[in-house]
Interface confidence: low
């Protein structure tokens, strides 16, 4: 059509210049378009140089939109993580502070001469919470054994108990010198800390996945399709035509096919995180136990003082008469030791509020990956509000007829807009799917009260989570899988935990 040859390119010139490109690239009037490599080759206002500049620009715009979405999601997850993580750390810090304030007056030198043992216990609990690969049951057992040894020496300074130590250690389980406190703390702490740390870790892994997926480059085929979607209408001389909705969805479903494959495991992870929050409440819940460690320690020392005479008699009976230390003072106590009655502090409602907010956010972001194409089309791609004869269909102004593809890589086999090789999934995204699976399995294990090792997350992620857990007093002690002296470095520890902190050499 000769008339179209003389059509002015002023509108395109204005748009092109606004993007910061040189106006000298733009022809005054339409030219023949055989040189075009992406846009339809009719009469056009775009030179090769313009087409490439706009292709670059459209890709950068999509990448920028993707990064914006990712950053917003990461910010949401980080807010939840920091709020809940800070709360759990504060509970443990408050427990230790209460112990440091109350124990000296109540227990005298039974506490003051053993502050190191108590401080070390809290340090280990802190490490464990933050993801260190240590065995909590063994850590607690070591603490009680060490404490018993030291307190026995203090209670019987006139004896020479060194010969006794082996015997005392062997008798400890039968004698139960600290009453029920060690067993109760072991059962409750393992489940509480596992629940708390796995939830916070889950938020960390989710955020990490989003960050890594945001770094996946768009395929060249996608770049062509995005250019065609966003700017070929300008080159074609219909700059006012906005992309047809279904056309935009097909382009972005093709471009983000690999990302949509995260959907199933992403949902599984978020479901497991919502579920684990059940373990935060009640007398054996994370809040009560982590904030009440000092209560069980006080119970233990109270029990030891109550049982002191019976205990000594039983030890003599089991281990023989001890030698007397001629330089040692008698069993009289240097300072009066009292009993300490501590109440668990009532919940402030802070955690309930934090968890309620986190659960709402987790539900909101469940369909993030599959809704991404639609969201970007609506919010970033200037998509036409309706599919009609006036929208841009990639070739001209007119209705877009192809059907909308399903979600994910496999469904793109016949995508008319983006050539997607469905036999070549993106390896970064496959790795992130595996990370989601591994974390979900940990959360399922944690729900059953299992002490989950936070090892290198490159394991195969297999194994099934247990069911609904078991009441505190019916869960038996597990056999240690690894000695607490062979602790591995962490790759997925909680924020702030360095590799050195995650290791402990024997």
């Amino acid at each position: 059509d000769p008339a179209s040859k003389s059509r002015s390119c002023s509108e395109v010139r204005q748009i092109y210049g606004a993007k910061g490109f040189s106006l000298s690239d733009v022809p005054q009037a339409e030219i023949s378009g055989e040189h075009l490599r992406i846009c339809p080759q009719g009469y056009t206002c775009c030179t090769s140089e313009m087409e490439e500049n706009l292709a670059n620009h459209s890709r950068m715009e999509l990448e920028s939109a993707l990064h914006d979405s990712s950053r917003a999601l990461q910010a949401t997850l980080a807010t939840q993580l920091h709020g809940i993580d800070d709360h759990f750390q504060r509970l443990l810090n408050d427990s230790e502070r209460t112990l440091q304030e109350a124990f000296p007056g109540a227990f005298g030198d039974l506490y003051t001469q053993n502050t190191r043992a108590f401080r070390d216990l809290y340090a280990e609990l802190r490490l464990y919470y933050r993801g260190a690969n240590l065995h909590l049951e063994e850590t607690l057992a070591e603490f009680w054994a060490r404490l018993l040894e030291r307190l026995f020496k203090q209670l019987h300074p006139q004896l020479l108990p060194d010969d006794y130590l082996d015997c005392l250690g062997k008798q400890a389980e039968a004698l139960r010198p600290f009453g029920d406190a060690p067993r109760e703390l072991r059962l409750r702490a393992t489940r509480a800390f596992v629940a708390a740390r796995s939830f916070v870790q889950g938020l960390g892994v989710a955020s990490d996945v989003v960050r890594k997926v945001a770094q996946v480059p768009l395929a060249p085929e996608c770049s062509r399709a995005i250019m065609k979607l966003v700017y070929c209408a300008h080159c074609r001389g219909v700059p006012g035509a906005r992309p047809c909705p279904d056309y935009c969805r097909n382009v972005l479903k093709g471009c983000l096919a690999n990302q949509a494959d995260l959907d199933a495991e992403w949902r599984n992870l978020l479901d497991s995180m919502v579920l684990i929050t059940d373990k935060f409440w009640g007398p054996s819940g994370a809040e009560s136990v982590i904030g009440g460690v000092h209560v069980w320690l006080a119970e233990a020392i109270n029990a030891l003082q109550d049982n002191k005479d019976t205990l000594t008699a039983k030890v003599i009976q089991a281990c023989g008469n001890p030698k007397v230390n001629p330089h040692g003072s008698g069993p009289e106590e240097k300072r009066r030791r009292g009993k300490l009655a501590l109440q668990e502090k009532p919940s402030t409602g802070t955690l309930e509020k934090l968890v309620s907010e986190a659960k709402a956010q987790l539900r909101d972001i469940q369909d993030f990956w599959i809704s991404l194409p639609g969201t970007l089309c609506s919010e970033k791609m200037a998509m036409s509000p309706a599919s009609d004869d006036r929208c841009w269909n990639g070739i001209s102004k007119g209705r877009y007829l192809p059907e909308v593809m399903g979600d994910g890589l496999a469904n793109q086999i016949n995508n008319p807009e983006v050539e997607v090789d469905i036999t070549k999934p993106d390896m970064t995204i496959r790795q992130q799917i595996m990370q989601l699976k591994i974390m979900t399995n940990r959360l399922r294990g944690a729900y059953g009260g299992n002490d989950v090792d936070f090892q290198d997350a490159s394991d195969d992620g297999s194994g099934s989570g247990s069911g609904g857990g078991c009441p505190d007093d019916t869960c038996g002690r597990r056999v240690s899988k690894k000695s607490s002296s062979s602790r591995t470095p962490l790759t997925h520890a909680l924020p702030g935990l360095s590799e050195q902190e995650g290791q402990k050499t024997s």
Epitope: R37, E52, N56, M60, P217, L218, P220, R224
Partner: antibody, heavy 125, light 109 residues
Framework: AVTLDESGGGLQTPGGALSLVCKAS????????MGWVRQAPGKGLEFVAS????????AYGSAVKGRATISRDNRQSTLRLQLNNLRAEDTGTYYC???????????????????WGHGTEVTVS | VALTQPASVSANPGETVKITCSGS????????YGWYQQKSPGSAPVTVI????KRPSDIPSRFSGSTSGSTATLTITGVQAEDEAVYFC???????????FGAGTTLTV
Amino acid sequence: AVTLDESGGGLQTPGGALSLVCKASGFTYSSYAMGWVRQAPGKGLEFVASISSDGSDTAYGSAVKGRATISRDNRQSTLRLQLNNLRAEDTGTYYCAKSYRCSWNCWDYAAKIDAWGHGTEVTVS
Amino acid sequence: VALTQPASVSANPGETVKITCSGSGSYTGSYYYGWYQQKSPGSAPVTVIYNNNKRPSDIPSRFSGSTSGSTATLTITGVQAEDEAVYFCGSYDRSSDSGIFGAGTTLTV
């Protein structure tokens, strides 16, 4: 005129590390992707690494991935290649090369080279 | 993914020479190619075509580039003795997400 001057080559020991520097002049350095291409004696050209104009995107050839780090200083107009754990097969001439434009994530860098340095020889022995 | 080039091509002065470069396998990735001339081993390459069809200002107009699908062609119209060299094509390897070069074609005039 565009000039690219490589330095840092020479005799290197296996297992050691190499640091090559390319000093650029004659063009607005910060606007262009840059990279390194090498050539073993008697062999063809091999892509080593590329970096986008602002330094945010990098790409590495499969033979050096995990051992190489490409970086740039736009104020000094310098390009750097750090190559660790050197092997005999890293021997060759290393060329610094300028790209006409970094299209997107530099994925097509090897198709857009419009200027080359004279090269610096590296021998790992 | 590999870029396939003929090992050698020969021509008489004044003839038109075409050197091809094809992306193999299920390669549908890049649609940009560059052509680089190396006159002797160890001498620096010279770009004759970049970005499929762009020619640096100091390269004679007898050099041109074109593409069709995943195949690029370097055409030298009216080849001259000084064009004798090894010609490498360069493109993109999607599997490794990085640059890739063909093995080179020796042009004998």
